[in-house]
Interface confidence: low
Amino acid sequence: SEVEYRAEVGQNAYLPCFYTPAAPGNLVPVCWGKGACPVFECGNVVLRTDERDVNYWTSRYWLNGDFRKGDVSLTIENVTLADSGIYCCRIQIPGIMNDEKFNLKLVIKPAKVTPAPTRQRDFTAAFPRMLTTRGHGPAETQTLGSLPDINLTQISTLANELRDSRLANDLRDSGATIRIG
C-alpha cells in the first residue's frame, strides 16, 4: 500500500525518497513518474537523475535536497487538484530486477481558510524556497521571492535544513529509503 502525503491547492507538495549511496557521490540513477511504478522504468517521467546529475525535469518538479547524498525527494510546486494521484520513485540499482520502487500517494485538498492546523504524520507544507549556505556553523537561510538562474544543487527547503541539522554526515531513513552497498 502507498504511503499517503497531503497538500493543499497552491502549496508545494513534498514526496520523500532516499537512498544511501555506497560512497558519497557514487550515485544511482533515479526516476520519478506520475502513476504507479511499472515493471521497468517510470511511466510519465517528470524528473530523472543519472550517475552525475539531474538530467531531465519538467516544470514545477524539482529535487529540494542534496541528491548527491541520496536525497531524491520530489517537490511539486504550486499544486492543483490535478496533481493528486500516485507517484513512483524508482531507484535504478544496477543489475537485473534490482530496482527499488516506491509508490507514494499524493492527496490534494482544496485550500481552506486557516483553521487551527494539525500536524500530520506525513506533514507536507508550503515552505518558502530557501537558498542555503552551509558552513561549519548553523546553516543560514534566506527566503527568496523567486529563483531565476539558481543551480539545482543550491536549492533547498526548510525540510532539508531539518534533516541536515540532525547529523551532518548521516542520511536519515524515510518513508522511501534504501541503502546501497
Epitope: F123, A125, R166, R172, D173, S174, T177
Partner: antibody, heavy 121, light 107 residues
Framework: EVQLVESGGGLVQPGGSLRLSCAAS????????IHWVRQAPGKGLEWVAD????????EYADSVKDRFTISADTSKNTAYLQMNSLRAEDTAVYYC??????????????WGQGTLVTVSS | DIQMTQSPSSLSASVGDRVTITCRAS??????VAWYQQKPGKAPKLLIY???FLYSGVPSRFSGSRSGTDFTLTISSLQPEDFATYYC?????????FGQGTKVEIK
C-alpha cells in the same frame, strides 16, 4: 550546545493547574518539533503532546486532550505545557524533547532533565 | 494506536555478553523506530533512529535492525555503563508510542 531545560513542576491538588516551560538553547525551536513525554514513577515513557512552533501544528495524546495545551514562543525559544484539570494519574516526571517536523524522522535527539509533577490532595 | 511490544521486560547479563532486545509493532511502521537508553533518575538518550542508524556519539557496539514489523536492538559486547533500561518507540503515526521497556541488569 543544544540544551532543553524544563521548569514549573510541583505539587498540585486534583483539579488544579500547572504550566510547564521548556527553555531551549543552541537551536531555533521554529525549525523543529518540541515534544512533551512523561514518565510515571516506576513506569515507562508516554508521549503527551507536540508542537511544531514554526507552523503552529499541535498534537495530543487522547489521555490529555481537552485538558492540556501545548504552545510555544519562538521569540523566547521556549515551549509550554499548560495542564488543567489535573488528575492523580498525571503524576509523573515531564520531559521536553526535540524532534523533527517530518514524522518519519521524528525521533528525539535532545531531552531536558525533566520536572516532577505530583497531583495529590 | 500502534502497540510496540517489547521483549524481554528484563534480562540479566554479564560484561562482554551479546544482548538482543526486540520490539514488535502491531502494524506497519516502516523504518520509523527509535531506541533509547535510560538510566535511573536521568532522561532517555537516543541510541538508534530510523530503525538502523546509529546516533552521533553512540558507541558502535549498539546496532539496530528491522525485519518487517520486528525491530531489534543489539549490544554486541555489553559494557558496565550499558546496564540501564531500553525503550523502543515508533514515530510513524500519531500518537507516537513506546515499548514498555527492557531492564538490563548485571548477572
Amino acid at each position: 550546545e543544544v540544551q532543553l531545560v524544563e521548569s514549573g513542576g510541583g505539587l498540585v491538588q486534583p483539579g488544579g493547574s500547572l504550566r510547564l516551560s521548556c527553555a531551549a538553547s543552541g537551536f531555533n525551536i521554529g525549525n523543529y518539533a518540541i515534544h512533551w513525554v512523561r514518565q510515571a514513577p516506576g513506569k515507562g515513557l508516554e508521549w503527551v503532546a507536540d508542537i511544531t512552533p514554526g507552523q503552529g501544528y499541535t498534537e495530543y495524546a487522547d489521555s490529555v486532550k481537552d485538558r492540556f495545551t501545548i504552545s510555544a514562543d519562538t521569540s523566547k525559544n521556549t515551549a509550554y505545557l499548560q495542564m488543567n484539570s489535573l488528575r492523580a494519574e498525571d503524576t509523573a516526571v515531564y520531559y521536553c524533547a526535540r524532534g523533527y517536523v517530518y514524522r518519519m524522522w521524528d525521533s528525539y535527539d535532545y531531552w531536558g532533565q525533566g520536572t516532577l509533577v505530583t497531583v495529590s490532595s | 494506536d500502534i502497540q510496540m511490544t517489547q521483549s524481554p521486560s528484563s534480562l540479566s547479563a554479564s560484561v562482554g555478553d551479546r544482548v538482543t532486545i526486540t520490539c514488535r509493532a502491531s502494524q506497519d511502521v516502516n523504518t520509523a523506530v527509535a531506541w533509547y537508553q535510560q538510566k535511573p533518575g536521568k532522561a532517555p538518550k537516543l541510541l538508534i533512529y530510523s530503525a538502523s542508524f546509529l546516533y552521533s556519539g553512540v558507541p558502535s557496539r549498539f546496532s539496530g535492525s528491522r525485519s518487517g514489523t520486528d525491530f531489534t536492538l543489539t549490544i554486541s559486547s555489553l559494557q558496565p555503563e550499558d546496564f540501564a533500561t531500553y525503550y523502543c518507540q515508533q514515530h510513524y503515526t500519531t500518537p507516537p508510542t513506546f515499548g514498555q521497556g527492557t531492564k538490563v541488569e548485571i548477572k
